[in-house]
Amino acid sequence: AGSDSLYVPCAPSPCVNGGTCRQTGDFTFECNCLPGFEGSTCERNIDDCPNHRCQNGGVCVDGVNTYNCRCPPQWTGQFCTEDVDECLLQPNACQNGGTCANRNGGYGCVCVNGWSGDDCSENIDDCAFASCTPGSTCIDRVASFSCMCPEGKAGLLCHLDDACISNPCHKGALCDTNPLNGQYICTCPQGYKGADCTEDVDEGNSHHHHHH
């Protein structure tokens, strides 16, 4: 039965993954494995991850006689050692005119006046620090605020008494309050002049404004 079915250990080679077969006896062989493989026929890829050096939160992925790192979004490079420049990647990372500043492992926004938050999307509530007089209503604006005054009060902060309350303007004149000093301003109808619109004027002159 013998000679027609002679077993030749290395023909064909049982070594896989590029391993080289060497006959060591009539029925025995040895595989010399390429780096990164082990086993009697070089069938196992050696796990290189136990000795990995993935940095900055990178996760090891085994390769052949090496390893690779799967990096978090803020990092790149073979070992996650290179900082991603989010400011280049996302030109609109900072909103409302904010300036993007790249940092190791992230980025920050330097917001323009009136805006806050990680991406400058939050309008700062200026009313939180406003000094509108009690009884008035604060309205938040971008980097500013305005005070809505109750009847009888005037001025930017509603801290002045409204001079128009006493109806100082005569002859159907319009009364406005100067927001800086609270004094009244009369806009006289045609034919009248003076601080209170009590004086007649020559024909030909139209509306007059008088401050008091």
Partner: antibody, heavy 120, light 107 residues
Amino acid sequence: EVQLVESGGGLVQPGGSLKLSCAVSGFTFSDFYMEWIRQASGKGLEWIAAQRNKANDFSIVYSASVKDRFTISRDTSKSTLYLQMNSLKTEDTAVYYCSRDGGKLALDAWGQGTLVTVSS
Amino acid sequence: DIQMTQSPSSVSASVGDRVTITCQTSEDIYSGLAWYQQKPGKSPKLLIYGASRLQDGVPSRFSGSGSGTDYTLTISSLQPEDFATYYCQQGFKYPLTFGGGTKVEIK
């Protein structure tokens, strides 16, 4: 400012034990790999143990020369790295440094070192 | 383990000289190489990481180059404070390994 300060070194007999501490400050301790390196008098640097960061589950690696004898650990609440050394041998005599692996495959901050002498 | 062969083991040089130290690794470390300076009684200090990147605060006379298995540290113009021992270290995988050191001495 990043600072690492080792303590706990001293004279110990062969077969004895010693626990080294490394108090750290100036950085988020759990974010970094930490290493222990030693240097025998007049010799070169020898890495002996590492603990990876929180993102890597604080996993641990040892050199063959200290495996099963030394234990690296950290207490994040105390910002302290430790090296428990058991079954000490005369060849363990060295200055022991703790160092921070700065996220660039390099050791960017080192302590001042603490001397361990194993002698009878 | 990755073997590190650093040469020369010592070099005598004068202030102003250009000094070159080489480090060869037993396998490709993908530029994961660092260089350190150590003075007597002091801790090592990181000079170069990633084979060629200068650590913050390190003078520009120090430079690193190389890839694969061959790396070089160059001091372009030696200064009095540069007399020390220099070590290379691979950071590609554990165990971390160091070169044997190069002592730069005054000629």
